[in-house]
């Protein structure tokens, strides 16, 4: 496929990635699906610099990222290694709290109002951020 060399309209370019910031809320699974349909993924935070960039754009609002432990261990949606990668959890998080009584634990990660991360009930409709990398092969066939 052809390579994406510039960001789509309404996406923000930063360090060879494109970001789209929602202004509405979706459950984590619905946000994940939205990004996939855009040939992107929920944002994967790999550095303090990227954390600050995303935090600047979302403000003090709960916002989903591409990190979850719905199948056991914590995993980034693009396969980035969680154990060795950047982390910015709030103190004593993640706690996979079952005591909320809503069913299940807390399997999806979001930016909190101060930018640090928390695990929460995946069904809650929070804002979300999609990310796609420039220079990656897109799904579109090349022009002949």
């Amino acid at each position: 496929g052809s390579e994406r060399t510039c960001c789509p309209v309404n996406w923000v370019e930063h360090e060879r990635s494109c970001y789209w910031f929602s202004r509405s809320g979706k459950a984590w699974a619905d946000a994940d699906n939205y990004c996939r349909l855009e040939d992107a993924h929920l944002v994967v935070v790999t550095s303090w610099e990227e954390q600050k960039f995303v935090q600047h754009h979302i403000g003090p609002v709960n916002t989903w990222m591409g990190l979850h432990d719905q199948n056991g261990p914590w995993k980034w949606v693009d396969g980035t290694d969680y154990e060795t990668g950047f982390k910015n959890w709030r103190p004593e998080q993640p706690d996979d709290w079952y005591g909320h009584g809503l069913g299940g634990g807390e399997d999806c990660a979001h930016f909190t109002d101060d930018g640090r991360w928390n695990d929460d009930v995946c069904q809650r409709p929070y804002r979300w951020v999609c990310e796609t990398e420039l220079d990656k092969a897109s799904q579109e066939p090349p022009l002949l």
Epitope: K26, A27, W28, A29, D30, G99, H100, G101, L102, G103, G104, C122, Q123, P125
Partner: nanobody, 117 residues
Amino acid sequence: EVQLLESGGGLVQPGGSLRLSCAASGFTFAAYSMMWVRQAPGKGLEWVSDISPGGRHTYYADSVKGRFTISRDNSKNTLYLQMNSLRAEDTAVYYCAKMGSTTFDYWGQGTLVTVSS
């Protein structure tokens, strides 16, 4: 067929109160967590509050904490949202929603709350 029917919205002055109701049918209401969400004019969907199946556990968005109270009556298959100290920024269409395994899988048609003097 799952149905959720909200009522109780209307025009209220700043500082006033309203009580929203959501009548549920078509599923075992007492077995599911429920949620209130809202959408302000020209804005996106926002989580407001949710409640556990038995009603013992309740949670609120920071923007409504201390002013809104979610409750439920499982004998009447009804969800409530008591809204006090209303502000202009609470103006929105309010929806009740049933929490599924990965998302909120059903929601009603909404009831409009307008806070204005």
